[in-house]
Amino acid sequence: NFMYSKTVKRLSKLREYQQYHPSLTCVMEGKDIEDWSCCPTPWTSFQSSCYFISTGMQSWTKSQKNCSVMGADLVVINTREEQDFIIQNLKRNSSYFLGLSDPGGRRHWQWVDQTPYNENVTFWHSGEPNNLDERCAIINFRSSEEWGWNDIHCHVPQKSICKMKKIYI
């Protein structure tokens, strides 16, 4: 029976993934019950991705490693809609690392997953980025401009946002 074997495979995958994420929240994609898309609990989901707000304060490098251990990366923001979704879960008095850095200090910003950096889809606070020694990007709230990006020193501990593609089982 096809449906039975599909269910057995799905349960086997769920059990296997429990060593990394003890609980997954899954939804059926469209009308076809063959495909379930899942995010770890209590990550949030938007379009085809899952997001996790890490409240531990760490450097950019340690924050990225923390994400990668979970099968994710520091967040890459591709659209205004995605940023608008993300900020719903952030605290105004905190700053969060993005997956955006300028390792050479030459203003060659790069996303951690090699998504091309597009000046037209950036949300820097006015006057930012403003320091060649500040080579990592955060998102934070400024009362005058709401949520936007700022460059900071990579070693300064911040909270962070992890993002991964939904898990399909």
Epitope: E16, Y17, Q19, K65, S68, V69, M70, V112, M164, K165
Partner: nanobody
């Protein structure tokens, strides 16, 4: 946790071949995308090759394309790097790296996307 141990390095003449191995222990190997990187003194770790969780996708640095081949054996929990037509500029310490991936075909070419690293194995190519 995943532990990685490289082997197979050594000294070889230009034009020669080596097969590097990276044995993994710890968590389910078949859920980890794998990569090989190399480093020479005073330089950053450089991407060499990567292979997806399923083994169906691979990618290589331009400098090694056509000469290096990455493969994996999930049953043996091992990833391999076959290196042929060696050049003196291939001299480096070669590191194997692992990264959890829930995507069967995803490839990772950037060092900071990997969570776990081996200690490295030295490859020396002389003319």
């Amino acid at each position: 946790q995943v532990q990685l141990q490289e082997s197979g390095g050594g000294s070889v003449q230009a034009g020669g071949s080596l097969r590097l191995s990276c044995a993994a222990s710890g968590r389910t190997f078949s859920n980890y995308a794998m990569g090989w990187f190399r480093q020479t003194p005073g330089k950053e770790r450089e991407f060499v090759a990567t292979i997806s969780v399923s083994g169906s996708s691979t990618d290589y640095a331009d400098s090694v394309k056509g000469r290096f081949t990455i493969s994996r054996d999930n049953a043996k929990k091992t990833v391999y790097l076959q290196i042929n037509s060696l050049k003196t500029e291939d001299t480096a310490v070669y590191y194997c790296a692992a990264r959890l991936s829930f995507d069967n075909t995803a490839l990772y070419t950037s060092a900071n996307r990997y969570s776990y690293w081996g200690q490295g194995t030295q490859v020396t190519v002389s003319s």
